[in-house]
Interface confidence: low
């Protein structure tokens, strides 16, 4: 988790002088509780936005927006803590809005936004906005949280972001798999324009079951430049196991930008359809 660039982040708006600061996610008001604390944020919204860095890279960011409740507690509002928690790693990053002037009611509801948290493809986050100071231990909570799921690199807008392109999102291998005689599969796919090796991972399963009955890895050496964008054809020999008939073929590239963590593409061959066997006709008629 990180912030997009480290240029000056602003939270000021007409009628409010405000500065954005790095936060340890442990505001001082936890340790030294105040008697009077503001109410919680209202209408917290998280959306996927895209932003360019100063170097021109494009990253997905969490666009966080919320409003204030129209009650007198805004007189005690000193700022807000924004926290983003990545759920699969428990990594947390916080920033603090510090109000340098007192808030006053005005004719419009106060609205705040922040769009500088860089998020990763295919990850889930919990976004929390805490109004400051935080409540006393038994006080009413004054935060709002929402979960936010970032689409993976298959998503049209995500595909052209720097992290997705680095992981090979622009490569479309257009995999075809056909079953040949004598327990063989022919796998065909389009090579990318990089001299790097590929790996075909074959996993076979019984019909309607999810435990594998055969696994095989096939290494494809790096193509020469004249082979870029050409089709590569590989014939894989299957294990002759009755019922081991559903095959998943996964192609893993090793592009220099993503090493061994490049996006994989897969195709599946289903088991052949079994003709419906008619129920046997009894050779005697039951008497009842």
């Amino acid at each position: 988790l990180r912030l997009l660039d480290h240029r000056a982040l602003v939270c000021s708006q007409p009628g409010l002088n405000c500065t954005v600061k790095n936060s340890t996610c442990l505001d001082d008001s936890w340790i030294h509780p105040r008697n009077l604390t503001p109410s919680s944020p209202k209408d917290l919204q998280i959306q996927l936005h895209f932003a360019h860095t100063q170097q021109g890279d494009l990253f997905p960011v969490a666009h966080i927006e919320w409003t204030l409740q129209t009650d007198a507690s805004i007189l005690y509002l000193e700022g807000a803590e924004l926290s983003v928690l990545q759920l699969n790693t428990n990594e947390r990053l916080c920033v603090r809005f510090e109000f340098l002037s007192k808030l006053r009611h005005h004719h419009r509801r106060w609205r705040f936004t922040f769009s500088h948290f860089v998020v990763d493809p295919d990850q889930e986050y919990e976004v929390t906005v805490h109004h400051l100071p935080k409540p006393i231990p038994d006080g009413d909570p004054n935060h709002q949280s929402k979960n936010f799921l970032v689409p993976d690199c298959e998503h049209a807008r995500m595909k052209v972001t720097t992290p997705c392109m680095s992981s090979g999102s622009l490569w479309d291998p257009n995999i075809t798999v056909e079953t040949l005689e004598a327990h063989q599969l022919r796998v065909s796919f389009t090579l990318w324009n990089e001299s790097t090796h590929y790996q075909i991972l074959l996993t076979s399963f019984p019909h309607m079951e999810n435990h594998s009955c055969f696994e095989h890895m096939h290494h494809i050496p790096a193509p020469r430049p004249e082979e870029f964008h050409q089709r590569s054809n590989v014939t894989l020999t299957l294990r002759n196991l009755k019922g081991c008939c559903r095959h998943q073929v996964q192609i893993q590239p090793f592009f220099s930008s993503c090493l061994n963590d490049c996006l994989r593409h897969s195709a599946t061959v289903s088991c052949p359809e079994m003709p419906d066997t008619p129920e046997p006709i009894p050779d005697y008629m039951p008497l009842w």
Partner: nanobody, 119 residues
Framework: QVQLVQSGAEVKKPGASVKVSCKAS????????INWVRQATGQSLEWMGW????????VYAQKFQDRVTMTRNISISTAYMELSSLRSEDTAVYFC????????????WGQGTLVTVSS
């Protein structure tokens, strides 16, 4: 917390071999691949290969295919990378990097081991 701790700096003569270790802690060693990457002064990162610590299965970059061997000792959660027939251009900092194969980036790196090849 997750840590990858590598062995110390080495000075080797041309033609010799070097074996760098990478001790993992803070996670299940066999659940993540270990990559080996190197960086010579002023050069970009160069990926050398990876190993699945569970099966011991390895994939080596073509450039190093004949000279590199990646192994592991599961009982002490340690991965090893041995590079043979050293030449002066192998002088670099060698890193181990943990990477789940379905993630889109490597997530934890060792501190690096400087290998100097000099006669």
């Amino acid at each position: 917390q997750v840590q990858l701790v590598q062995s110390g700096a080495e000075v080797k003569k041309p033609g010799a071999s070097v074996k760098v270790s990478c001790k993992a802690s803070g996670y299940t060693f066999t659940s993540y691949d270990i990559n080996w990457v190197r960086q010579a002064t002023g050069q970009s990162l160069e990926w050398m290969g990876w190993m699945n610590p569970k099966s011991g299965y390895t994939v080596y970059a073509q450039k190093f295919q004949d000279r590199v061997t990646m192994t592991r000792n599961i009982s002490i959660s340690t991965a090893y990378m041995e590079l043979s027939s050293l030449r002066s251009e192998d002088t670099a900092v060698y890193f181990c990097a943990r990477g789940r194969r379905d993630d889109w980036k490597n997530n934890y790196w060792g501190q690096g081991t400087l290998v100097t090849v000099s006669s």
